[in-house]
């Protein structure tokens, strides 16, 4: 048994069929010795008397808000929550698994850039009686500080007959160095409660994997005279990491033409220019990627070519 | 919102067997604990059985080796199969759904059905 918070307790149980479960004592927050009786959530069943009390934990029927009381004054309470083992593998039901990049991805995670800011999320079939709060830093030995603001609820989409939800957290690292080569990784930690239930999650990462630039800002065309080519220009999105001349990205750009089943014309380039053929009804298409390492492509920015 | 229909309940002697069955519609089905408690008069309801979404099997002594919970996701029901029945097991059968297991508590579940009677004659 370990204290997640003040007053909050998580019991460890590695459950089977017939399991006898862990034995638990709570002690009574009191300097009172005598006439202290027990009571388990709003029941007013008598579980035991004296300062201690020592439960078998052997279902999440035991589980809940045990009370301390003496001549109908409450002294102290502690909710037990269960982190349940089963076959050797801790329960993982209250996150869905994302299964990308691969199976058991419950924490996935972007940057938008090398400041050391990272926006990780998770998605879940549950509405209610959900807590979660998030935890990370560089390293694990010695760790190094990362702040995390509250997880909160960013997106509802239906799925067939559920609602699924997500929830989003923004963390920073403390003291990020932009152009420093990483050598440990970030972890990031959640605690997750769901009722009675407790699970934990985690991810580590290096920021230079999931970084993922917002896509080409003030993407335009130019038509070039007695020509059916255009040039296209755009920017370095907003939020790219500065200055750009060592931050460099490089740009994919894309003619698409109305059906999906046309041919797609591709060019590469490292400039932040192009020239191509517009095609009627196609549309141009612009993605960046870092330049010195093969991590995520932003998503698209398009113009239309009429 | 999940809705659990019971049905299979009757007039049995002791000693033989039934089957019970609950229907369960509305949000996916695999996603939920499923329980099955029963209530005879004037009594608290009592836990029988649960399964879990991974067909994990929880029981109390009252009623192990002699009752089986099983589930078919595929059919979005799950079935409690009664043998070597007795008078004392004559109650109103109820189908929960939840998201603890294991769990004996009824209020651990948040779904419940209307209700099957079963009754043990001897």
């Known amino acids: 048994i370990w204290e997640l918070k003040k007053d909050v307790y998580v019991v460890e149980l590695d459950w089977y069929p017939d399991a006898p479960g862990e034995m638990v004592v709570l002690t009574c927050d009191t300097p009172e010795e005598d006439g202290i009786t027990w009571t388990l959530d709003q029941s007013s069943e008598v579980l035991g008397s004296g300062k201690t009390l020592t439960i078998q934990v052997k279902e999440f029927g035991d589980a809940g808000q045990y009370t301390c009381h003496k001549g109908g004054e409450v002294l102290s309470h502690s909710l037990l929550l269960l982190h349940k083992k089963e076959d050797g593998i801790w329960s993982t039901d209250i996150l869905k698994d994302q299964k990308e990049p691969k199976n058991k991805t419950f924490l996935r995670c972007e940057a938008k850039n090398y400041s050391g800011r990272f926006t990780c999320w998770w998605l879940t079939t549950i509405s209610t009686d959900l807590t979660f709060s998030v935890k990370s830093s560089r390293g694990s030995s010695d760790p190094q500080g990362v702040t995390c603001g509250a997880a909160t609820l960013s997106a509802e989409r239906v799925r067939g007959d559920n609602k699924e939800y997500e929830y989003s957290v923004e963390c920073q690292e403390d003291s990020a160095c932009p152009a420093a080569e990483e050598s440990l990784p970030i972890e990031v930690m959640v605690d997750a409660v769901h009722k009675l239930k407790y699970e934990n999650y985690t991810s580590s990462f290096f920021i230079r994997d999931i970084i993922k630039p917002d896509p080409p800002k003030n993407l335009q065309l130019k038509p070039l005279k007695n020509s059916r080519q255009v040039e296209v220009s755009w920017e370095y999105p907003d939020t790219w990491s500065t200055p750009h001349s060592y931050f460099s990205l490089t740009f994919c750009v894309q003619v698409q033409g109305k059906s999906k089943r046309e041919k797609k014309d591709r060019v590469f380039t490292d400039k932040t220019s192009a020239t191509v053929i517009c095609r009627k009804n196609a549309s141009i298409s612009v993605r960046a990627q870092d330049r010195y390492y093969s991590s995520s492509w932003s998503e698209w920015a398009s113009v239309p070519c009429s | 919102e999940v809705q659990l229909v019971e049905s299979g309940g009757g007039v049995v002697q002791a000693g033989e067997s039934l089957r019970l069955s609950c229907a369960a519609s509305?949000?996916?089905?695999?996603?939920?604990?499923m329980g099955w408690f029963r209530q005879a008069p004037g009594t608290e309801r009592e836990f029988v059985a649960s399964?879990?979404?991974?067909?994990?099997?929880y029981y109390p002594d009252s009623v192990k080796g002699r009752f089986t919970i099983s589930r078919d996701n595929a059919k979005n029901t799950v079935y409690l199969q009664m043998s070597s029945l007795k008078p004392d097991d004559t109650a109103v059968y109820y189908c929960?759904?939840?998201?603890?297991?294991?769990?004996?508590?009824?209020?651990?579940?948040?779904?419940w059905g209307q209700g099957t009677q079963v009754t043990v004659s001897s």
């Open positions: 929960a759904a939840g998201q603890l297991f294991p769990s004996s508590r009824s209020r651990d579940y948040d779904y």
């Open positions: 509305g949000r996916t089905f695999s996603n939920y604990e």
């Open positions: 399964i879990s979404r991974r067909y994990s099997t």
